[in-house]
């Protein structure tokens, strides 16, 4: 499994999408786990609803939410109020019994907020081809999401 990089801004929301074959994984619950070291175990963060038919319902664990479009075959994880300690390697998983298949390895990169001027030695002014609005695009991707950018992430 190769890795997909998602980059987000500290203090904002990051949406991660893991596409999968909806037929192959029909009836299976999904999970989001954090990889502990390169060869260590993957520690469960959050999983979809216990009833597979209710997988579309968003489930939270702390600041992390999961929801599954079982027909479209897209697992979506939202990391709210992203912090530097959220950076690292994760997995989207498909569960069957006590086993878990890796759908996708995900590397979360956290970057400084361009509008937060508390970082010493980091003077910043918008360049000619970027605006403050551009700097606050929510970092998200899925089959359909890249058509139009979301100018401001939801604060929920």
């Amino acid at each position: 499994h190769n890795t997909t990089v998602f980059q987000g801004v500290a203090g904002q929301s990051l949406q991660v999408s893991c596409p999968y074959d909806s037929m192959k994984h029909w009836g299976r619950r999904k999970a989001w786990c954090r990889q502990l070291g390169e060869k260590g175990p993957c520690q469960r963060v959050v999983s979809t609803h216990n009833l597979w038919l209710l997988s579309f319902l968003r489930r939270w664990n702390g600041s992390t939410a999961i929801t599954d479009d079982t027909l479209g075959g897209t697992l979506t994880i939202t990391l709210r109020n992203l912090q530097p300690h959220d950076a690292g390697l994760y997995q989207c998983q498909s569960l069957h019994g006590s086993e878990a298949d890796t759908l996708r390895k995900v590397l979360v990169e956290v970057l400084a907020d361009p509008l937060d001027h508390r970082d010493a030695g980091d003077l910043w002014f918008p360049g000619e081809s970027e605006s403050f609005e551009d700097a606050h695009v929510e970092h998200s991707i899925s089959r359909s999401l890249l058509e139009g950018e979301i100018p401001f992430p939801p604060t929920s």
Epitope: N2, Q7, S17, P19, D119, L123, W124, D134, R143, L146
Partner: antibody, heavy 118, light 107 residues
């Protein structure tokens, strides 16, 4: 405006190491990832890896692990790439580039030409 | 690694022509695709990211389309300044990979 200024051309002997720099200006250095890409004469582009200046996290193309080492210095808004155990195969133009929030590389340095020859 | 294949390494074109450059990924890259233009002696320039989003300052005659494994860069009416080499790049899966390039030459 945004600029990535790379260090000048390098002529080095086989077996030696070289460290090239990429100085960023016109934007907040810790808000964007810096990538390194090489291009051999008359050939295409190849991704070497990136550094996240905010976390100092790196991600390498497996092919360049052990060959390239990426670092950054927040105080001077500069990214560095060190290449070791150089051979003539490493002769190329090396670019640094910033990835935008849509992930494409929106600003590039002018390139550093590395020539490895005895 | 994901292979990016640009079917033509070079194209002979006339000014004013509509030009279509194709790029095929070895697996689905879910629209995580960028197009670059490079002129001799210069660094590449980002034209399109997210398969379809035109970068600021890029003329509207450039258009990106496609999904899944197959992507296209179109130039509606070729201008002199468009003569260059064009590269596609996927950033769905590490290592991020580029196509071999398509060089446009005037007939």
């Amino acid at each position: 405006g945004v600029q990535l200024q790379q260090s000048g051309p390098e002529l080095v002997k086989p077996g030696a190491s070289v460290k090239m720099s990429c100085k960023a200006s016109g934007y907040k250095f810790t808000s964007y990832i810096i990538h390194w890409v090489n291009q051999k004469p008359g050939q295409g582009l190849e991704w070497i890896g990136y550094i996240n200046p905010y976390s100092d996290g790196t991600n390498y193309n497996e092919k360049f692990k052990g060959k390239a080492t990426l670092t950054s210095d927040k105080s001077s808004s500069t990214a560095y790439m060190e290449l070791s155990s150089l051979t003539s195969e490493d002769s190329a133009v090396y670019y640094c580039a910033r990835s935008s929030y849509r992930y494409g590389f929106d600003y590039w340095g002018q390139g550093t030409t590395l020539t490895v020859s005895s | 690694d994901i292979q990016m294949t640009q079917s033509s390494s070079s194209f002979s074109v006339s000014l004013g022509d509509r030009v279509t450059i194709t790029c095929k990924a070895s697996e689905d890259i879910y629209n995580r695709l960028a197009w670059y233009q490079q002129k001799p002696g210069n660094a590449p320039r980002l034209l399109i990211s997210g398969a379809t989003s035109l970068e600021t300052g890029v003329p509207s005659r450039f258009n990106g389309s496609g999904s899944g494994k197959d992507y296209t860069l179109s130039i509606t009416s070729l201008q002199t300044e468009d003569v260059a080499t064009y590269y596609c790049q996927q950033y769905w899966s590490t290592p991020w990979t580029f196509g071999g390039g398509t060089k446009l030459e005037i007939k």
